[in-house]
């Protein structure tokens, strides 16, 4: 009974929830549930019944594979989906799919907190701003990644002349998308005019 699959998809996409194994042969009934107790659709003796739910009109069941097709998923569709199959023997088998729907990350804005010329070195503090999202950050100087320990929303570093970069890029990503923001400086250590 412990079949649990995790799925992460981008909001607005069409999703097919299905199991990796074959359905039991000649099963009697197949039901998809949303959050354990809300029926979405039930297949019974060659007929599907779609229940009144927020999914009505945007789901379709393929009884041969058991796949549930959902169009235009939204963040509110985050849930555990359960497919329950009643076998001819009277036994039930259950599969669970934990669906996580993520919005594509927005384009980040790089905010220059501080730039300071310090004895030929350049002290730099840049922050990568995006509205309240749980994302990963990667900073690049002229397309070369900074060390892992500097990878968070704020890049704070002192650069020596041989390490200067003209442009600094913040890449924000989640498991479904990534976007870049870039700011360019005039060597050695001043903001470039756009």
């Amino acid at each position: 009974q412990g079949h649990l699959v995790h799925m992460t998809v981008v909001s607005g996409s069409n999703v097919t929830l299905n199991i990796s194994e074959s359905l039991p042969e000649n099963y009697k009934q197949l039901t998809w549930f949303y959050t354990f107790d809300q029926k979405i659709v039930e297949w019974d003796s060659r007929k599907s019944k779609y229940f009144e739910s927020k999914f009505k009109g945007r789901v379709r069941l393929d009884p041969q594979s058991g796949a549930l097709y959902i169009s235009k998923v939204q963040k509110e569709d985050n849930s555990t989906y359960i497919m329950r199959v009643l076998k001819k023997t009277g036994n039930e088998q259950e599969w669970k799919i934990k669906l996580q729907v993520l919005d594509p990350v927005p384009k980040p804005v790089i905010k220059i907190e501080k730039i300071e010329d310090m004895d030929d070195n350049c002290y730099l503090k840049l922050s990568c701003v995006i509205p309240g999202e749980s994302v990963n950050y990667t900073w690049y100087g002229d397309k070369r990644p900074f060390p892992k320990e500097l990878q968070n929303s704020v890049l704070e570093t002192t650069l020596m002349p041989h390490n200067y970069s003209r442009c600094y890029t913040c890449q924000v990503s989640n498991s479904v998308s990534s976007k870049n923001g870039t700011v360019c400086l005039s060597p050695p250590c001043t903001l470039a005019r756009s």
Partner: antibody
Framework: QVQLVQSGAEAREPGASVRVSCKAS????????IHWVRQAPGQGLEWMGW????????NFAQKFQGRVTMTRDTSLITAYMDLSRLKSDDAAVFYC?????????????WGQGTLVTVSS | EIVLTQSPATLSLSPGERATLSCRAS??????LAWYQQKPGQAPRLLIY???NRATGIPARFSGSGSGTDFTLTISRLEPEDFAVYYC???????????FGQGTRLEIK
């Protein structure tokens, strides 16, 4: 047995509105979407939209947005389609149809059609 | 918006022959495609849905196949009552909307 019975033929002038009704019997009215499809003389099928009789929620083809209204009266087990600002090329047979299984994907039972003519 | 293109526009065959009608989608519709038959002065009738499932009461001589973008309706042995116009239909996901192909007229040769 499942039946959809539509109202009779209508004649209208350009700019007017028309209402077509579709009375259902033989099944649970609120379990299945009612779709409206039109067919101009000698032409193919054109989907106009659907109504979920349970909730009253509607969904229209882009082309008819703002000009079509779909309603239902669950006590009369009847769906209605109103089309406003009629033009001469709106002349067509209008069909109501029930979807096959309550999913909104395919249409298995159809009304007999209502002919609407539009001319001045 | 997904466009369905049916071919041929007209098919001339004799009773007893095999008819093969084609429907091509401009992008993948998975298996979510249906076929309808319409005779003059009548409402359409659902024949096949989900590409290959026969609707209730449809004779076994009608069969559907295909997935993705290419679909076929086959009538294994034409009966006189099969001569009609055939439409394929799919449903776009967003906004949810149904579209039909332009139709194939099956006529007696």
């Amino acid at each position: 047995q499942v039946q959809l019975v539509q109202s009779g033929a209508e004649a209208r002038e350009p700019g007017a509105s028309v209402r077509v009704s579709c009375k259902a019997s033989g099944y649970t009215f609120t379990d299945y979407f009612i779709h409206w499809v039109r067919q101009a003389p000698g032409q193919g099928l054109e989907w106009m939209g659907w109504i979920n009789p349970n909730s009253g929620a509607t969904n229209f083809a882009q082309k008819f947005q703002g000009r079509v209204t779909m309603t239902r009266d669950t006590s009369l087990i009847t769906a209605y389609m109103d089309l406003s600002r009629l033009k001469s090329d709106d002349a067509a047979v209008f069909y109501c149809a029930r979807d096959v299984d309550g999913s909104g994907w395919y249409l298995d039972f159809w009304g007999q059609g209502t002919l609407v003519t539009v001319s001045s | 918006e997904i466009v369905l293109t049916q071919s041929p526009a007209t098919l001339s065959l004799s009773p007893g022959e095999r008819a093969t009608l084609s429907c091509r989608a401009s992008q993948s519709v998975s298996i979510y495609l249906a076929w309808y038959q319409q005779k003059p002065g009548q409402a359409p009738r659902l024949l096949i849905y989900d590409a290959s499932n026969r609707a209730t009461g449809i004779p076994a001589r009608f069969s559907g196949s295909g997935s993705g973008t290419d679909f076929t309706l086959t009538i294994s042995r034409l009966e006189p009552e099969d001569f009609a116009v055939y439409y394929c239909q799919q449903r776009s996901d967003w906004p949810p909307s149904i579209t039909f192909g332009q139709g194939t007229r099956l006529e007696i040769k």
